[in-house]
């Protein structure tokens, strides 16, 4: 592949002019240790609006791995196990904060970035537009 | 608001012993400007597993405000608009990164923290345990 050298413009941590900069300790504290175990269940399969998960990888982002949901159907699964197109499977999206290496390839310099991720799907009643 | 005094133990940004520390520019870049406007839609009301959103606020966290979903019903809304208890409304949870001021009250020093948030709700078929 193409060799991308370390960016010579990587800022020095002592640079007082680096805009609105803070120090962040990346040793992550996990507040989730005693949370409800249901969070790691198989809702993605049992939902009436089931979804698949895809590994979204971006090495210039921290975290570099985010799992993204994609709804399996346009409609929702009915009581008979068939897809009902009178209802819609839609992604539930959330805006999350990530760190983006800036300048690129700098190991110790990041910028906060907001990205939108699909977390799962829900079944909604469609909005019906009546034509006069 | 309440004035939180600067903690005298706030680390110096030049402190090379501050563990696994990086510089982060807090001028947020928003990648979501051209995303689907449906994300800010009324899915929470139109879903067969509707939810309410509650404001979770923590001044020692960045972002300080996070909106958390709570399912309105144990069951799901059926075609007649009634709650069907043969199905379950469940929260879809996601692990997200936030910045936690560390030491507390320091304006320029944070630690990454993983927290679990409920983003919305989905309707699932219950797991039925048959008693022999």
């Amino acid at each position: 592949g193409i060799t991308i050298p370390r960016n010579p413009g990587c800022p020095n941590s002592e640079d007082k002019n680096f805009p609105r900069t803070v120090m962040v300790n990346l040793n992550i504290h996990n507040r989730n240790t005693n949370t409800n175990p249901k969070r790691s269940s198989d809702y993605y399969n049992r939902s009436t609006s089931p979804w698949n998960l895809h590994r979204n990888e971006d090495p210039e982002r921290y975290p570099s791995v985010i799992w993204e949901a994609k709804c399996r159907h346009l409609g929702c699964i009915n009581a008979d196990g068939n897809v009902d197109y009178h209802m819609n499977s839609v992604p539930i999206q959330q805006e999350i904060l990530v760190l983006r290496r800036e300048p690129p390839h700098c190991p110790n310099s990041f910028r906060l970035e907001k990205i939108l991720v699909s977390v799962g799907c829900t079944c909604v009643t469609p909005i019906v537009h009546h034509v006069a | 608001g309440i004035t939180i005094p600067r903690n005298p133990g706030c680390p110096n940004s030049e402190d090379k012993n501050f563990p696994r520390t990086v510089m982060v520019n807090l001028n947020i870049h928003n990648r979501n400007t051209n995303t689907n406007p449906k994300r800010s839609s009324d899915y929470y009301n139109r879903s067969t597993s509707p939810w309410n959103l509650h404001r979770n606020e923590d001044p020692e966290r960045y972002p300080s405000v996070i909106w958390e979903a709570k399912c309105r019903h144990l069951g799901c809304i059926n075609a007649d608009g009634n709650v069907d208890y043969h199905m379950n409304s469940v929260p879809i949870q996601q692990e997200i990164l936030v910045l936690r001021r560390e030491p507390p009250h320091c304006p320029n020093s944070f630690r990454l923290e993983k927290i679990l948030v409920s983003v919305g709700c989905t309707c699932v078929t219950p797991i039925v345990h048959h008693v022999a």
């Epitope: 991308i4 370390r6 992550i28 198989d42 998960l53 090495p59 799992w67 290496r101 190991p107 | -």
Partner: antibody, heavy 119, light 107 residues
């Protein structure tokens, strides 16, 4: 104590399939990605793919996409790697390993399962 | 795919020696490089992550450095239990790739 215990050695004929298991204990199985890596005799390490037991998501090395299938059974905290259409060059030790996505490393490994493909 | 070129492929040294192994990535991988030790018939063991961070319980004689494309792994004073094969590995982007290994033998 975190432990990953793999199934025993297998001998298969070319064209057959093999399914290797990896049972996890000592931590919450659904919290971490599971990766599979193989090592042919006297050779280096080759990444096969990843499964996240918590959400069922998978991703594969292109070289294995058509032949490898990764699954996980949450009720038994066991991950599986199935490899089909076996050929002699698939003879290798297959390892499961836990990956910490935020930290970016494989911290615990199974003891390895030797799969021999021979007619 | 990112190639990790490790050198030397084998190395003879004595107890107490200082040993250095290098790894070159085919493109920048920032600091997303780990070093593993493997003994015959055993699984690899993590020693260094993020190029220079020692994993829990790893003795201080093991160290790593580098960023971008060039990485170095050093054992400051070889101990008898250190004779093994060492691998570098990038987790910058999948497919995650390993160096071909350096076999460290007793002189």
């Amino acid at each position: 104590e975190v432990q990953l215990v793999q199934s025993g050695a297998e001998v298969k004929k070319p064209g057959a399939s093999v399914k290797v298991s990896c049972k996890a204990s000592g931590y919450t199985f659904t919290d971490y990605e599971f990766h599979w890596v193989r090592q042919a005799p006297g050779q280096g390490l080759e990444w096969i793919g990843v499964i996240h037991p918590g959400n069922g998501g998978t991703a594969y090395n292109q070289n294995f996409r058509d032949r490898a299938t990764l699954t996980a059974d949450k009720s038994t905290s066991t991950a599986y790697m199935e490899l089909s259409s076996l050929r002699s060059e698939d003879t290798a030790v297959y390892y499961c390993t836990r990956f910490l996505t935020y930290e970016g490393y494989f911290d615990y490994w199974g003891q390895g399962t030797l799969v021999t493909v021979s007619s | 795919d990112i190639q990790m070129t490790q050198s030397p492929s084998s190395l003879s040294a004595s107890v107490g020696d200082r040993v250095t192994i290098t790894c070159k990535a085919s493109q920048s991988v920032s600091i997303d490089v780990g070093w593993y030790q493997q003994k015959p018939g055993k699984a690899p063991k993590l020693l260094i992550y993020h190029a220079s961070n020692r994993y829990t319980g790893v003795p201080s004689r093991f160290s790593g450095s580098g960023s971008g494309t060039d990485f170095t792994f050093t054992i400051s004073s070889l101990q008898p239990e250190d004779f093994a094969t060492y691998y570098c590995q990038q987790d910058y982007s999948s497919p995650y790739t390993f160096g071909q290994g350096t076999k460290l033998e007793i002189k």
